[in-house]
């Protein structure tokens, strides 16, 4: 059978509701294997922008092979979750799950796919399709990790030092300089998961007269750039 | 190993009925989707329906529908084929084929049924 | 039904050199991100054998000179380079839900 490939592309688009849309099902070269009793559990790790609608897939196997599907949900500080359908009855069975926004796609026996619909950060976790047939189970589970954009500011607050913030972002952003200073770097941690990082740089050499800002984030990166004036200037403000 | 094994050849007069027989061995008979093909002398490969050994359930190409039925014998492991009113178009090589699950491909086929409808 | 159209219909090549396949579906085989389009061979008194699955995956004991592309509705088989065993009749088979396969493509060697 061919062997497991890594490789994951990410599809995104636009729904006619203007939201966008994620969906990691594919990777047409997945994970597939001698036929045993025991069928690999697939996992992957996936980030997804909040406030985006997500698609979640099952293996490729045709509902004519199945018994039972089911999506296992377990979010963080919740009690499990589970969406099951039976096709022998056409039956579809919840248990402690709800969070409206996650649905089936559709009619399960058209269509086994989960949606998420407008990613929120509690919707961090652990997403699993488990499907049944009459030789064993096949898995594919999903560690859904939701991504907020942190919004940026920079600022000279003393003379010749600068301030630079990513503000509520997930995960915590990364703070670089152009040129290097005499940096300190905190970071707070929200009780929502987000973390605002703020980086403070102090420049002694007197011909450096502009700073930039570089900030690295999973969704995305943004530079800011100051003059350095002998008196606090223009505060700058932005989203990545 | 995985094998499918297949009836002999048959020789049919026109509107009489044929019934193929695929003993399958080397895996669990009703863990497995079986598929039916058919492909007449120098022409291309056509489904004609699956039988689910695991629940009995079966589905039919529209056109074979009353015409054909497929069903099992869980205690010899096979499936079989029955192809009715028949006639020289039905003239072909009957093939029957196991679906794997991931996918849904076939990895598996029997060796092949010849049936001659002739008057 | 979604119908299966391969081209050319047959197809003559020398040995080292590049064939190429085509499957058109009449409409899309894929879905939940797979496309359910698999190659067979077939060679003279032979059952089909199985060459590619989901689109691109190679199965398990096919040379790695056959490859397999293509999402949506637009396939391609490609054997590269052929040798003068891959003188068979090729077809493409969507297997969703009800299956069809293709008319088929006879490859001979030159």
């Known amino acids: 059978a061919a062997q497991p490939n890594n490789s994951l592309m990410l599809q995104t688009s636009k729904e006619n509701h203007a939201l966008a849309s994620s969906s990691l099902c594919m990777d047409e070269k997945q994970i597939t294997q001698n036929y045993s009793k025991v069928l690999a559990e697939v996992n992957t790790s996936w980030p997804v922008k909040m406030a985006t609608n997500a698609v979640l897939c099952c293996p490729p196997i045709a509902l004519r092979n199945l018994i039972i599907i089911t999506w296992e949900i377990i979010l963080r500080g919740q009690p499990s979750c589970t969406k099951a359908y039976k096709k022998e009855t056409n039956e579809t069975k919840e248990t402690n799950c709800t969070d409206e926004r996650i649905t089936w796609v559709s009619r399960p026996d058209q269509n086994s796919d989960l949606q998420i619909r407008t990613v929120a950060i509690t919707h961090d976790g652990y997403y699993r399709c488990i499907m049944v047939t009459p030789d064993g189970n096949f898995h594919r589970g999903y560690h859904l990790q939701v991504l907020v954009t942190p919004e940026v500011t920079l600022f000279q607050n003393r003379n010749r030092t600068a301030v630079c913030k990513a503000v509520a972002g997930k995960p915590a952003a990364h703070i670089s300089w152009i040129p290097e200073g005499d940096c300190a770097t905190k970071q707070e941690y929200w009780s929502n998961g987000t973390v605002t990082v703020k980086s403070t740089c102090h420049w002694e050499v007197h011909n450096v007269s502009t700073v930039t800002c570089h900030v690295s984030h999973l969704t995305g990166n943004k530079s800011l750039y100051i003059e350095l004036l002998p008196v606090p200037g223009a505060k700058k403000s932005a989203k990545l | 190993q995985v094998q499918l094994v297949q009836s002999g050849a048959e020789v049919k007069k026109p509107g009489a009925s044929v019934k193929v027989s695929c003993k399958a061995s080397?895996?669990?008979?009703?863990?497995?989707?079986m598929h039916w093909v058919r492909q007449a002398p120098g022409q291309g490969l056509e489904w004609m329906g699956y039988?689910?050994?695991?629940?009995?359930?079966?589905n039919y190409n529209e056109k074979f529908k009353g015409r054909v039925t497929m069903t099992r014998d869980t205690s010899t492991s096979t499936v079989y084929m029955e192809l009715s009113s028949l006639r020289s178009e039905d003239t072909a090589v009957y093939y029957c084929?196991?679906?794997?699950?991931?996918?849904?491909?076939?990895?598996?086929w029997g060796q092949g049924t010849l049936v001659t409808v002739s008057s | 039904d979604i119908v299966l159209t391969q081209s050319p219909a047959s197809l003559a090549v020398s040995p080292g050199q590049r064939a190429t396949i085509t499957c058109r579906a009449s409409?899309?085989?894929?879905?939940?991100?797979?496309?359910?389009m698999h190659w067979y061979q077939q060679k003279p008194g032979q059952p089909p054998k199985l060459l590619i699955y989901?689109?691109?995956n190679l199965e398990s004991g096919v040379p790695a000179r056959f490859s397999g592309s293509g999402s949506g509705t637009d396939f391609t088989l490609t054997i590269n380079p052929v040798e003068a065993n891959d003188t068979a009749n090729y077809y493409c088979?969507?297997?969703?839900?009800?299956?069809?396969f293709g008319q088929g493509t006879k490859v001979e060697i030159k």
């Open positions: 084929a196991r679906e794997d699950y991931y996918g849904s491909r076939w990895g598996y």
């Open positions: 080397g895996y669990t008979f009703t863990s497995y989707v």
């Open positions: 039988i689910n050994p695991y629940n009995d359930d079966t």
């Open positions: 409409k899309s085989v894929s879905t939940s991100g797979y496309s359910y």
């Open positions: 989901l689109a691109s």
């Open positions: 088979q969507h297997s969703r839900e009800l299956l069809t």
